[in-house]
């Protein structure tokens, strides 16, 4: 659910972290309408997710820890 690189809504599916290679934060005060986490998948897809949902925060944390440990 994105338009001109901005997420307009959120996925209603829970993504498995094994398919996710990274993420980008979208901030509502930086030109987009809503806050979002944009997950980047192995298949080069971008998926908009709700940054307040626990599963999203959990994956963001796991990916951030991976980067920190590299």
């Amino acid at each position: 659910a994105s338009n001109f690189d901005c997420c307009l809504g959120y996925t209603d599916r829970i993504l498995h972290p094994k398919f996710i290679v990274g993420f980008t934060r979208q901030l509502a005060n930086e030109g987009c309408d809503i806050n979002a986490i944009i997950f980047h998948t192995k298949k080069k897809l971008s998926v908009c997710a709700n940054p307040k949902q626990t599963w999203v925060k959990y994956i963001v944390r796991l990916l951030s820890k991976k980067v920190k440990n590299m």
Epitope: I14, H16, K52, Q53, T54, W55, Y58
Partner: antibody
């Protein structure tokens, strides 16, 4: 009604290990996380670690990394926490608690009754 | 990580308020949750999403959040409200994502 049923009390010697279990009944194992939260005698609550069984990926508090392993058996809907190199200050009640991961409130809505782990020589 | 007063008290019928102070990485950007722990029991969810009550929790309990602080109010205090109360929140910057306050013991005089 969903319940989290925990294993019984354990007594261990310093330096040994303990493994406690938490079985979910009355609900599917999908779309929630199980955390372990401990409470030392007379103290507050401390998050030890947790797992999202559908992800099969565990996460641990920094204080416990390297000493704790949390795993899940999806077939029996049971989550395990193993704590190694036990110290006297690991004496505590260990609670398991559930979070619905598709929500945006991060609340532990269901708790087990707790497993008392006593470290004593 | 979250700071609560160690104790609070009131007489039956009174209003008691418990504060919970945090930072931008926890309360400032994530939902605040409150738990009630009766003596010898497991914690019980009391308030979620800052101010929402699960079904079965009396409306005497209310929560609020402002900035990096939150509070729990108990109006019409009853003897069965004597318990420990903990605030909690996800923390974006911590080594463990869920952080708790130290707990507040509420005594009904």
């Amino acid at each position: 009604e969903v319940q989290l049923v925990q294993s019984g009390a354990e007594v261990r010697k310093p330096g040994s290990s303990v493994k406690v279990s938490c079985k979910a009944s009355g609900d599917t194992f999908n779309n929630f996380a199980i955390s372990w939260v401990r409470q030392a005698p007379g103290h507050g609550l401390e998050w030890v670690g947790g797992i999202i069984p559908v992800f099969n990926t565990a996460d641990y508090a920094q204080n416990f990394t390297g000493r704790v392993t949390i795993s899940a058996d999806k077939a029996t809907k049971t989550v395990y926490m193993e704590l190694r190199s036990l110290r006297y200050d690991d004496t505590a009640v260990y609670f398991c608690a559930r979070t619905k991961i598709e929500l945006d409130n991060d609340a532990f809505d269901i708790w087990g009754r707790g497993t008392t782990v006593t470290v004593s020589s | 990580v979250l700071t609560q007063p160690p104790s609070a008290s009131g007489t039956p019928g009174q209003r008691v308020t418990i504060s919970c102070s945090g930072s931008t990485s926890n309360i400032g950007s994530n939902a605040v949750v409150w738990y009630q722990q009766l003596p010898g029991a497991a914690p019980k969810l009391l308030i979620y999403s800052n101010d929402q009550r699960p079904s079965g929790v009396p409306d005497r309990f209310s929560g609020s959040r402002s900035g990096t602080s939150a509070s729990l109010a108990i109006s019409g205090l009853q003897s069965e409200d004597e318990a420990d109360y903990y605030c909690a929140a996800w923390d974006d910057s911590r080594d463990g994502p869920w952080v708790f306050g130290g707990g507040t013991k509420v005594t009904v005089l």
